[in-house]
């Protein structure tokens, strides 16, 4: 396993609809054909997998069914979007990139993006 640098923004604020987007960029040392991108959430020293995708360079990302993530790729950048976020989902979201093919295998883990989610205030009832 060889190391690879991965960069991502330090902080992102989710929209009022619970959508957060950020760019995950990796420094590809070789001729990557297939890349796996995994988003991990770290909260209270626990790490859980949020979503994972695989893609061939130049093609769209393939996420597993029922994924809360979507994304696009451009060169060595992956634009990730996480949907359905609520205030309780606030935390550090780490981008993990693996160059799956061809060998040798490279692994890179970003420092994480702190995503802040603020639940929208419910609309007050109006009297007409």
């Amino acid at each position: 396993c060889k190391a690879m640098h991965v960069a991502q923004p330090a902080v992102v604020l989710a929209s009022s609809r619970g959508i957060a987007s950020f760019v995950c960029e990796y420094a590809s040392p070789g001729k990557a054909t297939e890349v796996r991108v995994t988003v991990l959430r770290q909260a209270d020293s626990q790490v859980t997998e949020v979503c994972a995708a695989t893609y061939m360079m130049g093609n769209e990302l393939t996420f597993l069914d029922d994924s809360i993530c979507t994304g696009t790729s451009s060169g060595n950048q992956v634009n990730l979007t996480i949907q359905g976020l609520r205030a309780m989902d606030t935390g550090l979201y780490i981008c993990k990139v693996e160059l799956m093919y061809p060998p040798p295998y490279y692994l890179g883990i970003g420092n994480g993006t702190q995503i802040y989610v603020i639940d929208p205030e419910p609309c007050p009832d109006s009297d007409f």
Epitope: T33, T62, P102
Partner: antibody, heavy 118, light 107 residues
Framework: QVQLQQPGAELVRPGSSVKLSCKAS????????MHWVKQRPIQGLEWIGN????????HYNQNFKDKATLTVDKSSSTAYLQLSSLTSEDSAVYYC???????????WGQGTTLTVSS | DIQMTQTTSSLSASLGDRVTVSCRAS??????LNWYQQKPDGTVKLLIY???KLHSGVPSRFSGSGSGTDYFLAISNLEQEDIATYFC?????????FGGGTKLEIK
């Protein structure tokens, strides 16, 4: 449409070598890795190795590293599998297949039936 | 090497049935599981890639699921043209390995 054309059959003598061909059409040959798979009735499907037609980088299954050699001819969009020191164990159907995402093979040749017999 | 096991070597079902073919890996393959159909004449086609993604042109009656080491191919409303042998293949680690196949027959 994508097509991988392979000869239907080859009959060769034990101890000799053979070069199986796989002619690709319908896509940019150098943009996709080509893989080779061996099939025997009892042993099932075995991955032999792969080659990147753009620069001829290869990777082999250790079980085939002394048996198989993969090459390509970019000018004719053809991939080749050469098998050496043939024995009856090499009698099988050999498929070429184009690599797709998640290391799947989205298009396969019809297969070449290799018979090693004296 | 990762071993891929299809415990059922043959399966008999009636037209219109829903059938499930299973495949187990000797270690976690992280959803890099693909399914193929091989017809009696030797023709091989990709059905499902990355566990559940339907390859273009494949009828929607085919579906895939699973995670970790256990994966499944389901065929609903079985048709005569589905008579074939189905193979799973892991694409997580070289060398890529295949299951032994499950031959589907009509009752």
């Amino acid at each position: 449409q994508v097509q991988l054309q392979q000869p239907g059959a080859e009959l060769v003598r034990p101890g000799s070598s053979v070069k199986l061909s796989c002619k690709a059409s319908g896509y940019t040959f150098t943009s996709y890795w080509m893989h080779w798979v061996k099939q025997r009735p009892i042993q099932g499907l075995e991955w032999i190795g792969n080659i990147d037609p753009s620069d001829s980088e290869t990777h082999y299954n250790q079980n085939f590293k002394d048996k198989a050699t993969l090459t390509v001819d970019k000018s004719s969009s053809t991939a080749y599998l050469q098998l050496s020191s043939l024995t009856s164990e090499d009698s099988a159907v050999y498929y070429c297949a184009r690599r797709y995402t998640s290391s799947s093979f989205d298009y396969w040749g019809q297969g070449t039936t290799l018979t090693v017999s004296s | 090497d990762i071993q891929m096991t299809q415990t059922t070597s043959s399966l008999s079902a009636s037209l219109g049935d829903r059938v499930t073919v299973s495949c187990r890996a000797s270690q976690d393959i992280r959803n890099y599981l693909n399914w193929y159909q091989q017809k009696p004449d030797g023709t091989v086609k990709l059905l499902i890639y990355f566990t559940s993604k339907l390859h273009s042109g494949v009828p929607s009656r085919f579906s895939g699921s699973g995670s970790g080491t256990d994966y499944f191919l389901a065929i609903s409303n079985l048709e005569q043209e589905d008579i074939a042998t189905y193979f799973c293949q892991q694409g997580n680690t070289l060398p890529y390995t295949f299951g032994g196949g499950t031959k589907l027959e009509i009752k």
